[in-house]
Interface confidence: low
């Protein structure tokens, strides 16, 4: 599925990221546009052999199992394919895990190099939450 | 139950192209990978690539690029292996599998026959 | 890319032999190594993953183990359905690459 701007802004609002970690909404959004460009079946191979999932790109080496990644962790204990459902869910409650982890939003390299600094929030205007 | 049904047998010219389907049921196909797999006497199994069908992510082995071209359609649960200007080295069997690292299901294999 | 070498070539054994086959990575692959059992004109069956997890339907007296590059394959009391090929592959790196084979054959 690929997300209209201001149709992920609500569902990511409901699954309760608005200011989840002290990262206002408009922080995800953007996120999300400049790692998946808002597909949730975005998948992109690393060079160590991992990949990331998903519409926010959550890499297999530490937070998904998708069998074939060495030496995986899979901290978020899924599986790798339920990253690229329609359906959300899983990749918030990842991305939630991920963002207490100590790096905050570091963690997404997109989100450092094109959101941090940012006007997040022309990401929502707009947008009826 | 998971099932890779592939495509019947082909004989083909040399220099022609060929598309070989791989049809899955029993899972969420647009979510696992679809690996594709070389198999001629002699020479064993070779890893020819992959696809995820869900977003058309593909990885070729560096052999075989510019040989195979994968595609999917998540609409009928099919992915493809189209194989391009077919030498008698490509007479083989052409096998899908699911990729979950290992390969834990296999399609029955296509013989492709490439001959003058 | 990581080559995989499978030895002996060809086994022969009698039905009720124990065996063990080796599989050899040219460089550590971790546990990440499987095992196929073909039988002709047979698509592959997967027999055990990472090393030695059996696969669903297996019987017991598949097992396998090892680490790193060296990696065996063990059929206790080998039955007459056991006879047929036998390959590795390693899903350590890309490309993904399978063992020669072993050829178990009735003696």
């Known amino acids: 599925k690929v997300f209209g701007r201001c149709e992920l802004a609500a569902a990511m609002k409901r699954h309760g990221l608005d200011n989840y970690r002290g990262y206002s909404l408009g922080n995800w959004v953007c996120a999300a546009k400049f790692e998946s460009n808002f597909n949730t079946q975005a998948t992109n191979r690393n060079t160590d052999g991992s990949t990331d999932y998903g519409i926010l790109q959550i890499n297999s080496r530490w937070w998904c199992n998708d069998g074939r990644t060495p030496g995986s962790r899979n901290l978020c204990n899924i599986p790798c394919s339920a990253l690229l459902s329609s359906d959300i869910t899983a990749s918030v409650n990842c991305a939630k895990k991920i963002v207490s982890d100590g790096n905050g939003m570091n963690a997404w390299v997109a989100w450092r190099n094109r959101c941090k600094g940012t006007d997040v929030q022309a990401w929502i205007r707009g947008c009826r939450l | 139950q998971v099932q890779l049904q592939e495509s019947g047998a082909e004989v083909m010219k040399p220099g022609a192209s060929v598309k070989i389907s791989c049809k899955a049921t029993?899972?969420?196909?647009?979510?696992?990978?679809i690996e594709w797999v070389k198999q001629r006497p002699g020479h064993g199994l070779e890893w020819i690539g992959e696809i995820l069908p869900g977003s058309g992510s593909t990885y070729y082995n560096e052999k075989f690029k510019g040989k195979a071209t994968f595609t999917a359609d998540t609409s009928s649960n099919t992915a493809y292996m189209q194989l391009s200007s077919l030498t008698s080295e490509d007479s083989a069997v052409y096998y899908c599998?699911?990729?979950?690292?290992?390969?834990?299901?296999w399609g029955q294999g296509t013989t492709l026959t490439v001959s003058s | 890319d990581i080559e995989l070498t499978q030895s002996p070539a060809t086994l022969s054994v009698t039905p009720g032999d124990s065996v063990s086959l080796s599989c050899r990575a040219s460089q550590s692959i971790s546990n990440n190594l499987h095992w196929y059992q073909q039988k002709s004109h047979e698509s592959p069956r997967l027999l055990i993953k990472y090393v030695s997890q059996s696969s669903s339907g297996i019987p017991s007296r598949f097992s396998g183990s090892g680490s790193g590059t060296d990696f065996t394959l063990s059929i206790n009391s080998v039955e007459t359905e056991d006879f047929g090929m036998y390959f590795c592959?390693?899903?350590?790196?890309?490309?993904?690459?399978f063992g020669g084979g072993t050829k178990l054959e009735i003696k």
């Open positions: 029993g899972y969420t196909f647009s979510t696992y990978w």
């Open positions: 592959q390693q899903s350590n790196s890309w490309p993904r690459t």
């Open positions: 599998a699911r990729g979950d690292g290992y390969y834990g299901y």
